[in-house]
Interface confidence: low
């Protein structure tokens, strides 16, 4: 294992990293630790403000966590010759607020990308597709981890954060091979309806710890490979028949629904009936009512139709969406 801990150069970011001198095979960037045997480079918690230009060509696993990168420009990892082996790239917690189009171009083996815990005020629609063509070359990405990338309210663009993320996921249909997508803890109020249709290979989708109120306009129908759907810790009030039928029709899926504020009124009857007979929901015996007050903490599986009535004087704003 080789490592370098000398002070990094303060030279400005190269306009095109591809024009940099090719690194020596055993070179390790300043402020990084390198292991050729493990094909791993770690530049962790070093307050780096740019991606090192002199990454060794052998790198398969690159950790750039806990830095101050701020912006990932186009071609941030483009090198000549390219980093052809790089398979896993972790950029979590590096204070990124902008990921530009083509930031991950010229990484032909990149299978896993983690951008979690970065307050992304701007995520280019072409961050993952690399081009603005209506159909782009397929991305090699198989796992995309975007947990807690929501910026603080004062840094948000005018457009919806959900829409910005969705645009990046569907651009150019580049992510058709994506198997895993984590979008936990992003304050999502809704899931744009066209996103999942463009991700037909998904096996694992994590939408936990968001603020999703309804899945009425979300279609899971084409996610025939979906195996895990995490919807814990949202604001879901009820799942309607269309959603229930779609989930039941997915051959391999396991759905996680814990810690949602289920409203146990007459609109809940179909969901309760479905819960009693489905094997799709994991831990379904833990699901409890949150509203109305008289039903609080009742177990959904123990309810019958007589329990599920709608109070005629309940204001419409408190009824289910």
């Amino acid at each position: 294992t080789s490592s370098a801990s000398s002070s990094s150069s303060s030279a400005p970011f190269l306009a095109s990293a591809a024009s940099a001198q090719p690194p020596l095979p055993d070179q390790c960037p300043a402020l990084c630790e390198c292991s050729e045997a493990a094909r791993t480079v770690k530049c962790v918690n070093r307050n780096l403000t740019e991606v090192p230009t002199d990454l060794p060509l052998y790198v398969r696993n690159l950790f750039l966590t806990g830095n101050q990168l701020a912006v990932l420009p186009a071609g941030a990892f483009a090198r000549r010759p390219p980093l052809a082996e790089l398979a896993a790239l972790n950029l979590s917690g590096s204070r990124l607020d902008e990921v530009r189009g083509g930031a991950f171009e010229h990484l032909p083996s990149l299978r896993q990308l983690d951008l979690s815990h970065n307050p992304l005020a701007y995520l280019s629609p072409f961050a993952f597709s690399g081009s603005n063509a209506s159909i782009s070359a397929p991305s090699p990405l198989v796992e995309l981890i975007l947990n807690h990338i929501v910026p603080p309210d004062d840094k948000r663009q005018n457009r919806s954060f959900e829409g910005m993320v969705a645009a990046a996921l569907v651009a150019g249909r580049a992510l058709q091979g994506l198997h895993l997508l984590e979008l936990a803890s992003n304050h999502f109020l809704y899931l744009p309806r066209d996103v999942l249709a463009q991700l037909p290979s998904l096996r694992y989708l994590d939408l936990s710890n968001n603020s999703l109120v309804s899945l009425t306009y979300v279609s899971f129908r084409n996610l025939t490979h979906l195996e895990s759907l995490h919807l814990e810790d949202n604001a879901l009030k009820v799942l309607h028949n269309g959603t229930l039928a779609e989930l039941q029709g997915l051959p391999h899926v396991r759905v996680f629904l814990d810690n949602n504020p289920w409203v146990c009124d007459c609109h809940m009857a179909d969901m309760v009936t479905w819960l009693k007979q489905t094997g799709v929901v994991q831990g379904k015996d833990r699901l409890t009512c949150a509203f109305p007050e008289k039903m609080r903490n009742r177990v959904l599986l123990e309810l019958n139709s007589a329990d599920l009535d709608c109070d005629p004087i309940l204001p419409p704003s408190l009824q289910t969406s």
């Epitope: 493990a38 398979a87 896993a88 198989v142 796992e143 198997h179 694992y204 895990s228």
Partner: antibody, heavy 121, light 107 residues
Framework: EVQLLESGGGLVQPGGSLRLSCAAS????????MSWVRQAPGKCLEWVSA????????YYADSVKGRFTISRDNSKNTLYLQMNSLRAEDTAVYYC??????????????WGQGTLVTVSS | DIQMTQSPSSLSASVGDRVTITCRAS??????LNWYQQKPGKAPKLLIY???SLQSGVPSRFSGSGSGTDFTLTISSLQPEDFATYYC?????????FGCGTRLEIK
């Protein structure tokens, strides 16, 4: 240097329980999915269970589902396999292995040396 | 579950021979196929990942090919240390099954 060291194996009666541990070092443990693979004497490798880097997702072979529980403590860099309702056919050497590149695009690039579990009365 | 079938189950060969081992999946698994070598009393060792990529430190006489359902591990010129059991493994499915191995013996 990446190292995986299993422990906790031994002789147990049918219906009994055992907890295996795998101590990991030399890498950022929480960034990698991990797995247990077993091999009965003179038999093939059998994938048993896996767990994501965060511990949030777990996966089990049908032969152990409901009896075995995989877990991890990222603060201790340790992987566990809790084995309940053990049967004679669970007798095997149990290996822990590191997944490289996530779960759905994975390969096991480092393995421990294994710990022997014998289920017999 | 996806079943993996290896053939032959055992094979006798001589030093210097070219050897081919095949692995067939019960459904398409794209290129999510890995090959491991195991010697008696030892843990398995990764040789090939993603069907054709050679793991660091593995001699170049080992190569892998295939996509979909049919895969091949080739040893271009057998060396004495190559006599072992070889396993394929798919990581396409929810459960990551192994083939039952091909035992490579000295003729």
């Amino acid at each position: 240097e990446v190292q995986l060291l299993e422990s906790g194996g031994g002789l147990v009666q049918p219906g009994g329980s055992l907890r295996l541990s795998c101590a990991a070092s030399g890498f950022t443990f929480s960034s990698y999915a991990m797995s247990w693979v077993r091999q009965a004497p003179g038999k093939c490798l059998e994938w048993v269970s896996a767990i994501s880097g965060s511990g949030g997702s777990t996966y089990y072979a049908d032969s152990v589902k409901g009896r075995f529980t995989i877990s991890r403590d990222n603060s201790k860099n340790t992987l566990y396999l809790q084995m309940n309702s053990l049967r004679a056919e669970d007798t095997a050497v149990y290996y822990c292995a590191r997944y490289y590149g996530g779960y759905y695009s994975a390969w096991m690039d480092y393995w421990g040396q294994g710990t022997l579990v014998t289920v017999s009365s | 579950d996806i079943q993996m079938t290896q053939s032959p189950s055992s094979l006798s060969a001589s030093v210097g021979d070219r050897v081919t081992i095949t692995c067939r999946a019960s459904q398409s698994i794209s290129s999510y196929l890995n090959w491991y070598q195991q010697k008696p009393g030892k843990a398995p060792k990764l040789l090939i990942y993603a069907a054709s990529s050679l793991q660091s430190g593995v001699p170049s006489r080992f190569s892998g090919s295939g996509s979909g359902t049919d895969f091949t591990l080739t040893i271009s010129s057998l060396q004495p240390e190559d006599f072992a059991t070889y396993y394929c493994q798919q990581t396409y499915g929810y459960l990551h099954t192994f083939g039952c191995g091909t035992r490579l013996e000295i003729k």
